[in-house]
Interface confidence: low
């Protein structure tokens, strides 16, 4: 008799793929644009990335450090009108892209939460949640919650409002903290909260260190759904050298949870390569004319246009990984098992019931080395075969689809491999 199929878990929309943050509309659109109407014209691009949600803004009225002149119910006219926002929501829905609104109150000021008037601000947030839920948004983000006194209780209250409206609505909280205990204390009282933090921001050193960070986090959070990013708002290049960007894309897309990216992560956008551009929100490089005032600063391979035409580019890798992440059961909600491998390596398996299984091997080091996979670490339900098919490598030159002997697997410096193999009873 065939073994019984495992019952599928309940899947919310944010479980099915990546979220894409656009914190600065003007920098994202460039060319003197930067409003909601212009963003609507970029939704096809977001669709091509196969992302499931757009984390937008903040876009509300906020006069720096002035509570009275901060209105979470009003869109700053520089970004457009309520009608523009409604139109964006409708277009996004047609393309199956959910819209999450950032309501961090004092986003233009020194303290995001007006430290002296916490209760006033909390009331404003509550009113705003109800208003924007009625308007049709799919969720909310609040950042810098380490600056919010009694954050846990406020988040619990805001979560109740959000979930009370619909279980299909999401609340994201962001913190600059990288301390696991602080992160856990925020998560403790808030079931279903998606938390972005700087937890992984110092993970770039070695595979062993990354493995221990990831496994500690997953063990500590139990069976709750996680999100994966390197910070609550910043670009990957704020933390990583260029040679690790592909490796991290592969990792973020294949860990159990929701990967969260900032605009530009898909092309390796880096402020230091763009004279005069701010670290937190450099102008998005759509093509070579996106940064017109400094001739020669931008080459084609730094842009969306250039990378779209190159199957070996970071953007092409992002699109492929995003596509795999959104359609393979083992990557959508499969079990995760990390296991030992050679020095500088992080390797793990993702599997769900009788579906196709995935092996990820990441070489964080700058030397090529044999994988030396220790399958003895794995439970019987997740055993490794002798061979697995290469789905993709982060480096050019390997023949995709070819079976690789796991015993003899060797990785190039900074190479990541995604391999697939069938379930075997």
């Amino acid at each position: 008799r065939a073994p019984r199929c495992r019952e599928l878990p309940a899947q919310k929309w944010w479980h099915t793929g990546a979220l894409y943050r656009i914190g600065d509309l003007q920098a994202f659109q460039g060319h003197g644009a930067g409003n909601l109407a212009g963003l609507k014209g970029r939704l096809d691009y977001l669709s091509s990335l196969k992302v499931k949600g757009l984390v937008l803004g903040p876009i509300h009225k906020n006069q720096k450090d002035d509570v009275a002149q901060t209105d979470l119910l009003q869109i700053d006219p520089n970004f457009g009108s309520k009608e523009d926002f409604d139109s964006l929501l409708q277009s996004a829905k047609k393309k199956s892209i959910r819209v999450i609104l950032d309501l961090t109150p004092n986003y233009r000021g020194e303290n995001s939460w007006f430290s002296t008037q916490v209760d006033t601000v909390a009331t404003k947030v509550k009113d705003a949640l109800e208003f924007w839920l009625q308007a049709g948004v799919d969720g909310f983000q609040v950042r810098d919650i380490e600056n919010l006194k009694d954050a846990s209780s406020f988040l619990a209250e805001w979560q109740n409002i959000t979930k009370g409206f619909s279980e299909d609505r999401l609340l994201i909280a962001g913190t600059n903290s990288s301390d696991l205990q602080q992160i856990l204390s925020l998560l403790e009282s808030n079931k279903d909260l998606l938390l972005t933090s700087s937890y992984l921001s110092d993970s770039g050193s070695t595979g062993e260190h990354t493995k221990s960070l990831v496994t500690q986090y997953l063990n500590a959070t139990g069976n709750r759904w996680c999100s994966w990013s390197l910070s609550q708002a910043r670009l990957l290049t704020s933390f990583l050298p260029a040679q690790l960007l592909r490796l991290y894309q592969l990792m973020l897309f294949t860990l159990p949870g929701t990967p969260v990216f900032s605009y530009g992560d898909e092309i390796g956008l880096d402020a230091a390569a763009l004279p005069g551009q701010p670290m937190e929100a450099p102008v998005m490089l759509w093509d070579e004319s996106s940064f017109p005032d400094i001739p020669g600063a931008v080459s084609a391979n730094m842009t969306v246009k250039g990378q779209s035409e190159d199957p070996g580019s970071l953007l092409s890798l992002f699109r492929r990984l995003s596509d795999q992440r959104s359609k393979e059961r083992s990557l959508l909600h499969g079990d995760f098992h990390a296991f030992s491998a050679g020095p500088g390596l992080f390797s793990y398996i993702r599997h769900w019931d009788q579906n196709e299984r995935f092996l990820v091997v990441l070489n964080f080091g700058d030397v090529g080395l044999s994988a030396g996979l220790q399958a003895s670490d794995l439970p019987a339900s997740a055993s490794l075969p002798a061979k697995a098919d290469l789905l993709l490598s982060t480096q050019p030159g390997r023949e995709e689809g070819s079976p690789l002997e796991l015993e003899r697997l060797k990785l190039e410096p900074h190479e990541g491999l995604l391999l697939r193999f069938p379930y075997a009873a």
């Epitope: 910043r234 290049t237 230091a272 701010p278 670290m279 937190e280």
Partner: antibody
Framework: QVQLVQSGAEVKKPGSSVKVSCKAS????????IEWVRQAPGQGLEWMGV????????NYNEKFKGKATITADKSTSTAYMELSSLRSEDTAVYYC?????????WGQGTLVTVSS | DIVMTQSPDSLAVSLGERATINCKSS????????????LAWYQQKPGQPPKLLIY???TRDSGVPDRFSGSGSGTDFTLTISSLQAEDVAVYYC?????????FGGGTKVEIK
């Protein structure tokens, strides 16, 4: 808020090298670009180069290419600038600065004296 | 490279009087896509590192007294000290942060008359 503390004054012989350090504390090291600026005695300010400590990407003033090498170590939140083939005209105070674009935070400066 | 020219080289002003320093760029510092001027002003006292006063040509850094103000757009910029105090004696520099290499003006020394 970020505090930048630089290494102490150095006296060097012509032709030698010197490595000046700049240790950041306070805010996250990777939140800032680290810039290096020099000021010769009685002179104005001259921008030398910049590093993004997160990605390691650098940009140099043409004038200092081959003369200065800027690096950063995220694990110790420290940026470095090494000057090679020192000459008497390299005698100056060297400042590191934490910036987004403008130079918001400055180290106290390191005086490098090149003298035979 | 873009050249930043400051004038005058030095300036002697009575306490309580207005001091005005000019800075001219050989190329526009106004960036079309965000309509911001990529210019900053610094104050440097003897034996100290420079201190940021103004960025985006007219935004005062936190903690900077409101007697300091910046104005101008494109290629011509001004730093004004509306009522000179004894502690304002220093050298003032403008700096462009638009396109590498960043460049500074030659500096203006402000003294008390």
């Amino acid at each position: 808020q970020v505090q930048l503390v630089q290494s102490g004054a150095e006296v060097k012989k012509p032709g030698s090298s010197v490595k000046v350090s700049c240790k950041a504390s306070g805010n996250a090291f990777t939140n800032y670009l680290i810039e290096w600026v020099r000021q010769a005695p009685g002179q104005g300010l001259e921008w030398m180069g910049v590093i993004n400590p997160g990605s390691g990407i650098t940009n140099y003033n043409e004038k200092f290419k081959g003369k200065a090498t800027i690096t950063a170590d995220k694990s110790t939140s420290t940026a470095y600038m090494e000057l090679s083939s020192l000459r008497s005209e390299d005698t100056a105070v060297y400042y590191c600065s934490g910036s987004a674009n403008w130079f918001a935070y400055w180290g106290q400066g390191t005086l490098v004296t090149v003298s035979s | 490279d873009i050249v930043m020219t400051q004038s005058p080289d030095s300036l002697a002003v009575s306490l309580g009087e207005r001091a005005t320093i000019n800075c001219k760029s050989s190329q526009s510092l106004l960036y079309s896509s965000n309509q911001k001027n990529y210019l900053a002003w610094y104050q440097q006292k003897p034996g100290q590192p420079p201190k940021l006063l103004i960025y985006w040509a007219s935004t005062r850094d936190s903690g900077v007294p409101d007697r300091f103000s910046g104005s101008g757009s494109g290629t011509d910029f001004t730093l004004t000290i509306s009522s000179l105090q004894a502690e304002d004696v220093a050298v003032y520099y403008c700096q462009r942060y638009y396109g590498y290499p960043w460049t500074f003006g030659g500096g203006t020394k402000v003294e008390i008359k």
